[in-house]
Interface confidence: low
Amino acid sequence: LLDTRQFLIYNEDHKRCVDAVSPSAVQTAACNQDAESQKFRWVSESQIMSVAFKLCLGVPSKTDWVAITLYACDSKSEFQKWECKNDTLLGIKGEDLFFNYGNRQEKNIMLYKGSGLWSRWKIYGTTDNLCSRGYEAMYTLLGNANGATCAFPFKFENKWYADCTSAGRSDGWLWCGTTTDYDTDKLFGYCPLKFEGSESLWNKDPLTSVSYQINSKSALTWHQARKSCQQQNAELLSITEIHEQTYLTGLTSSLTSGLWIGLNSLSFNSGWQWSDRSPFRYLNWLPGSPSAEPGKSCVSLNPGKNAKWENLECVQKLGYICKKGNTTLNSFVIPSESDVPTHCPSQWWPYAGHCYKIHRDEKKIQRDALTTCRKEGGDLTSIHTIEELDFIISQLGYEPNDELWIGLNDIKIQMYFEWSDGTPVTFTKWLRGEPSHENNRQEDCVVMKGKDGYWADRGCEWPLGYICKMKSRSQGPEIVEVEKGCRKGWKKHHFYCYMIGHTLSTFAEANQTCNNENAYLTTIEDRYEQAFLTSFVGLRPEKYFWTGLSDIQTKGTFQWTIEEEVRFTHWNSDMPGRKPGCVAMRTGIAGGLWDVLKCDEKAKFVCKHWAEGVTHPPKPTT
């Protein structure tokens, strides 16, 4: 059986596959997925290995019409480096010389300057080029190679291994060499895979059942460390509770060097955030951190300094901590907008079972603002999702020059932010450089400010506007008609009406259904529309909803089904990669993120059209 990294190299014109008959004869044969001699895989960014021989495809020289055969894999050899050229051409790196079928006289696969059909190759059984099944570096754990990547194939006791192995070990632990010749170099590490005993690489907190992996012997950049965690279905460490910090301080107390954690400010326009999307609500900076020096966008935990945090350049090589298992966040279900009939008093605006009101003109210090909101039957607003934030920004009449109190604060416990209404902190969206919590002045309260409504900590004694929020009443004097301009069953957002197509459909069928409704598969123009769509479909039980994006027309170029430019994307991790196909929005934990699927898969979908006679909620005038 093929593992996911292996593929057969297929020429459509001849309907035949590459077959490694011997190291010196690489020819073609009728395709057979069970034939080891036809299986290949990428073993580096640019090397393709024969699974049968554990040797790499290469040439004797970079010249026209020389035979492509198999050689001992050498990551430094220029004669083994391949790259996908436009469409389905495979060429020797840096040259216009292509992997070619040969001809009647020449049965061997050849290197040739021609780029016709005989030089075009796909992964058998797909429409994808060979690079779509590309190489993914596997970072090792423990061992003696500082967390370096596995080198496949590697030689152990004069035998070549193209995968992690337990050879030479009695405990069954899977390992790999990190250079091609383990026998000489003796460099190795354990593989980030599930195997008997791999759980002992993790420390489980008995109180929360969350597991942590301390990789103190590794030396990786922040991005490499994150990839290593993700290869184990984990993420770089996030810390949202004081208990969690205490547990990790104990776990790392015997170490001295810094360890990467998931905290970063890599997002261009927002502030400090955890890579696993946990809220940044607990701060444990080293005095003097975070330093504002440009480029210091990633954070390490310092065992030698009481496990406090320091921001560093992301390219530094350090150890790292991974985290997996139940999230440390309290479970807190946020009702979706459509679940809750919301009725609000005059001058309050409804959203998902709550009512909201901006007090812009009467500036108050945070304590007085809170008192006013509570007198009105509510509290300073808490915000639990990007959709709720989007509602406040785009529907409530929020203005780009506003600076308004919200309920987040760390008055009760320093450096531990909580909502004044007592709801759990499940989401944060800090402005760039925030929270700054400057030492020379107490910044214990939080404001929304700037065009995006992101957050900053502030001294609580500033007189500012504020936003109140209260639970909606079951009956109210005023029912706001929000679906004006849309047909029954469609939902309105700004200029447009949206409808969920409930029939499981292929991309083409979904597109046709929308067209029949005088609509089109949804486009997504910016993060505000994305936030609305995430709230629209994100909590539904189905896994995917088609959007109108695909690269059907031109492989590798994603376009909407209507003539509109693609100016915003919201790809899931590793997307779009080199996979051709049609784009659907995920639901659940990755709610709203875009995945590329095969266009003939069946999913629900979202149709969209212009609303008629569109109106906008009143915008308070200052």
Partner: nanobody, 112 residues
Framework: QVQLQESGGTLVQPGGSLRLSCAAS????????MGWYRQAPGKQRELVAG??????HYADSVKGRFTISRDNAKNTMYLQMNGLKPEDTAVYYC???????WGQGTQVTVSS
């Protein structure tokens, strides 16, 4: 940050024409859609016309009389208003990206 500045509002007689301009500055590359809204005294702010991608849209009350256009090279959006009526009297606001950015507004008064 994006700044929007409207101009062109004035007093005009019924049946007359006017052209409003909205100049965008700052991070204009981030603008995806723009619209003209208006707010008459004591009334709700309403969308008059919108432009997004290559599509335009008009409120029923102005269809056939108003034309929205955009000059990307000049980072400017226009509203050509013909056959003006007294009920078109309002402060006209320029808006971008679903209400993420607003201009200060320009007064249009239609009166004899």
């Amino acid at each position: 940050q994006v700044q929007l500045q409207e101009s062109g509002g004035t007093l005009v007689q019924p049946g007359g024409s006017l052209r409003l301009s909205c100049a965008a500055s700052g991070s204009t590359f981030s603008i995806n859609n723009m619209g003209w809204y208006r707010q008459a005294p004591g009334k709700q702010r309403e969308l008059v016309a919108g432009i997004t991608g290559g599509n335009t849209h008009y409120a029923d009350s102005v269809k056939g009389r108003f034309t929205i256009s955009r000059d990307n090279a000049k980072n400017t959006m226009y509203l050509q208003m013909n056959g003006l009526k007294p009920e078109d009297t309002a402060v006209y606001y320029c808006n971008a990206n679903w209400g993420a950015y607003w201009g200060q507004g320009t007064q249009v008064t239609v009166s004899s």
